[in-house]
């Protein structure tokens, strides 16, 4: 590979590293679960994530925070969308594990490929967000 | 050892303007989003604005907004408030914080903090 | 803007007392953004408190946060001479990113 092209990925790398995602993850996981309150979900399930959404949070309350944050960490990456790309796929990865079921992750993911449009970012064009243990072909 | 040290800090007519200057070290300044926090005398903590890692998210409180520019050098390690139009209630120490986050949980606090430069409006 | 009010404005009490500090918001505060600093005259704030409910490094166990929604609060325990300050709630989720004004908490 040629040097320009390793140091991109180094700076894409430490990029990451200083980037909070979670308010990223916390806004999707809100949008989803206030999706399926409305759709006779019990909003009072109990969670594991102490800074998940309260039944309170989750009808709207709250969430434009997670959203502003996220949406702050995400235009970080806005001049490099390979990077950006990584980002997503890192969100994807984070809360995969807390997905009940193929219906919510792929209704998470369709948020997920929304969120630098919403964010009034440029989103990027082939970003593979299948979670797999295996190695992923990104581009 | 991890410090900001704030200066800048003066007396100045209304009207007037002032740059401060807040110089990091001990740690990779580029790493972390900067914010600037006030106090008047006898008064709260007041924030007035913040960058984040490369300045492309900048906010501002409404008192300042039009008035006060922040911006953030990485190479020198160094952030700056420059403020013009000055007013009699602009009067205040300003302190220089670092933001940072949990980790595991994502958070954000102000963990580290200068020990301040005081700016006096005054005729 | 969120605004917080933090209540009372001065708290009176003995070393060996607990003390119960409140911080209500104007709308609705994600725990994630909820964050307690401690103030001791001709000093710089310190971080006391993160997420509602997280102690900082170095903070003892006597100092706790807690709450949700609009209303939080900082409890301390056993108050100890080193505790007087003035304690300050901050929320950092929405921009503008606003204080409390402050509760002052003095020995009686």
């Known amino acids: 590979r040629q040097q320009w092209e390793l140091q991109g990925d180094r700076r894409c790398q430490s990029q990451l590293e200083r980037a909070n995602l979670r308010p990223c993850e916390q806004h999707l996981m809100q949008k989803i679960q206030r999706d399926e309150d409305s759709y006779g979900r019990d909003p009072y399930s109990p969670s594991q994530d102490p800074y998940s959404p309260s039944p309170y949070d989750r009808r709207g309350a709250g969430s434009s925070q997670h959203q502003e944050r996220c949406c702050n960490e995400l235009n970080e990456f806005e001049n490099n969308q390979r990077c950006m790309c990584e980002a997503l796929q890192q969100i994807m990865e984070n809360q995969s594990d807390r997905l009940q079921g193929r219906q919510q992750e792929q209704q998470f993911k369709r948020e997920l490929r929304n969120l630098p449009q919403q964010c009034g970012l440029r989103a990027p064009q082939r970003c593979d967000l299948e979670v797999e243990s295996g190695g992923r072909d990104r581009y | 050892e991890v410090q900001l040290v704030e200066s800048g800090g003066g007396l100045v007519q209304p009207g007037g303007s002032l740059r401060l200057s807040c110089a990091a070290s001990?740690?990779?300044?580029?790493?972390?989003?900067m914010n600037w926090v006030r106090q008047a005398p006898g008064k709260g903590l007041e924030w007035v604005s913040s960058?984040?890692?490369?300045?492309?998210?900048?906010y501002y409180a409404d008192s300042v907004k039009g008035r006060f520019t922040i911006s953030r050098d990485n190479a020198k390690n160094s952030l700056y408030l420059q403020m013009n139009s000055l007013r009699d209630e602009d009067t205040a120490v300003y302190y220089c914080?670092?933001?940072?986050?949990?980790?595991?949980?994502?958070?954000?606090?102000?963990?580290?903090w200068g020990k301040g430069t005081t700016v006096t409006v005054s005729s | 803007e969120i605004v917080l009010t933090q209540s009372p404005g001065t708290l009176s009490l003995s070393p060996g007392e607990r003390a119960t500090l409140s911080c209500r918001a104007s709308?609705?505060?994600?725990?994630?953004?909820l964050v307690w600093y401690q103030q001791k005259p001709g000093q710089a704030p310190r971080l006391l408190m993160y997420?509602?409910?997280t102690r900082a490094t170095d903070i003892p166990d006597r100092f706790s946060g807690s709450g949700s929604g609009t209303d939080f609060t900082l409890t301390i325990s056993r108050l100890e001479p080193e505790d007087f300050a003035v304690y300050y709630c901050q929320q950092n989720g929405n921009s503008p990113y606003t204080f409390g004004q402050g509760t002052k908490l003095e020995i009686k």
């Open positions: 914080a670092r933001e940072d986050f949990d980790v595991s949980t994502g958070p954000y606090y102000m963990d580290v």
């Open positions: 001990g740690f990779i300044f580029s790493d972390y989003n």
């Open positions: 709308q609705s505060v994600s725990n994630m953004f």
């Open positions: 997420g509602a409910s």
């Open positions: 960058i984040t890692r490369s300045s492309r998210t900048i």
